[in-house]
C-alpha cells in the first residue's frame, strides 16, 4: 500500500539532487585552490543532514550549521556584489570582473543555485514530488532557510564598499520582501561597511530616466542611512554595453554618446 504523502504547493526536489550537489562540489573545489581541502562527501552528508527526516516546514538555521562550518570560505570582503531580481546579469558581471563575488560564486551558493530540495518527517526519503512554497505553505522550508542563512552570513562578512545590482524594470526596484531587502540590508555591519552602492539596471533601450530617484530607492537610502552606512546610486542604462566596457574601457564604443 503506497504511503500517504504530504502534497505541497511548490515543485519537488530537483531530479538527481544528491548527484548534482556532489558533482558541483567536486567541480568547485577543483577550480578554486583555496577550497581544495574540502571533503565533498562530508559536505553532502552535512547538506543532507540539514533536511532529511525533518518536517519541511520546521527547518531552522541551526540545522544548516554543520554545512556552514564545512563551507566556510573567505572572499575579499570589499569585493562583494549583492543582487535582487537580476541574478543572471550579476553573474555575467562577476564572470567579467573576476575580482568581485556574488553569493553564488562561493561554494555554498554555487552548490544550491537554482536547486529545490526537501525531505519528509521521520523518513529518510527525499521528496521529488513537491516541496513547500514560501507563500502558500510555510517560510521555514529547507530552501528558504538555506538562502536566508547563507545570505545573512555573506552580508555580515562584507566590508568597505558593498555593491548591489537592482532591477530597474520591476515595479519595486527595491523590494523590502526580497532576500536583499529582508536579510542582507539588515545584516551589513556599519562598523565595517562604509558605503552601499546601488546599480539600477535599466531594461528599456530608450529609458534614460534617473531611476535613482525612484521612491523605493529613496526608501533603501533611508534604511541604509539610519544604519549609519553611506548610500550611493548609479543608473546603468545599457547593461549589455556596460559589461563590454568593464571588460574593455578603451573600446571607442564605450566613449561615444549614442
Amino acid at each position: 500500500v503506497p504511503r500517504w504523502r504530504q502534497q505541497w504547493s511548490g515543485p519537488g526536489t530537483t531530479k538527481r539532487f544528491p548527484e548534482t550537489v556532489l558533482a558541483r562540489c567536486v567541480k568547485y573545489t577543483e577550480i578554486h585552490p583555496e577550497m581544495r581541502h574540502v571533503d565533498c562527501q562530508s559536505v553532502w552528508d552535512a547538506f543532507k543532514g540539514a533536511f532529511i527526516s525533518k518536517h519541511p516546514c520546521n527547518i531552522t538555521e541551526e540545522d544548516y550549521q554543520p554545512l556552514m562550518k564545512l563551507g566556510t570560505q573567505t572572499v575579499p570582503c570589499n569585493k562583494i556584489l549583492l543582487w535582487s531580481r537580476i541574478k543572471d546579469l550579476a553573474h555575467q558581471f562577476t564572470q567579467v570582473q573576476r575580482d568581485m563575488f556574488t553569493l553564488e560564486d562561493t561554494l555554498l551558493g554555487y552548490l544550491a543555485d537554482d536547486l529545490t530540495w526537501c525531505g519528509e518527517f521521520n523518513t529518510s526519503k527525499i521528496n521529488y514530488q513537491s516541496c513547500p512554497d514560501w507563500r502558500k505553505d510555510c517560510s521555514n522550508n529547507p530552501v528558504s532557510v538555506f538562502w536566508k542563512t547563507v545570505s545573512r552570513r555573506f552580508a555580515e562578512a562584507a566590508c568597505d564598499v558593498v555593491h548591489v545590482m537592482l532591477n530597474g524594470s520591476r515595479s519595486k526596484i527595491f523590494d523590502k520582501n526580497s532576500t536583499f531587502g529582508s536579510v542582507e540590508v539588515h545584516n551589513l555591519q556599519p562598523e565595517k561597511v562604509q558605503t552601499l552602492e546601488a546599480w539600477v539596471i535599466h531594461g528599456g533601450r530608450e529609458d534614460s530616466r534617473d531611476l535613482c530617484q525612484d521612491p523605493t530607492i529613496k526608501e533603501l537610502e533611508s534604511i541604509i542611512s539610519k544604519r549609519n552606512i553611506q548610500f550611493s546610486c548609479k543608473n546603468i542604462y545599457r547593461p549589455d554595453k556596460f559589461l563590454q566596457c568593464v571588460k574593455n574601457p578603451e573600446d571607442s564604443s564605450c566613449t561615444s554618446e549614442i
Epitope: E197, S232, K234, I236, R238, C245, P249, S256, E257, I258
Partner: nanobody, 126 residues
Framework: DVQLQASGGGSVQEGESLKLSCVGS????????MGWYRQAPGKDREFVAA??????????SYANSVKGRFTVSRDNAKNTVYLQMDNLKPEDTAVYYC?????????????????WGQGTRVTVSS
Amino acid sequence: DVQLQASGGGSVQEGESLKLSCVGSGRTFSDWAMGWYRQAPGKDREFVAAVSGAGRGGKPSYANSVKGRFTVSRDNAKNTVYLQMDNLKPEDTAVYYCAADRLVLVALSIADPGFWGQGTRVTVSS
C-alpha cells in the same frame, strides 16, 4: 564622503591650450577610474576623456571629438586627474565636470559615473 574639486577653466582663443585639474578627497583614488565630461550650452552632458585605475593599467580613453587634441593623465600621489586641452576649438566651449567611479567611466548613454565634481567653465572664442 567623496569630494571632487575641478579647476583650471577660463577663456582662450581658438588654437590655444588650457589644463584642467581635479583633486579627489575622502578616498584614495589610485584604483578608481577618473575623468572628464562636459556640457555645452543647450546640449546634453557628454563624455570627454577618462583614465582607468591602477589595477587596469591607468589607460586613457577619449571621445572621438577630442582624440589627438586632449590628453588625460593622473597623479595618484596627489589624487589628481588632469585634462590637457590643446588646439582648442569654439565647439569645445562648455562646463567641464570631473567624475570618478570605482569601476569604469563610460558614455552617459551607457552608465552614470559613481561621483560627480562641480564644473569649471571653458570658453573658446574664434
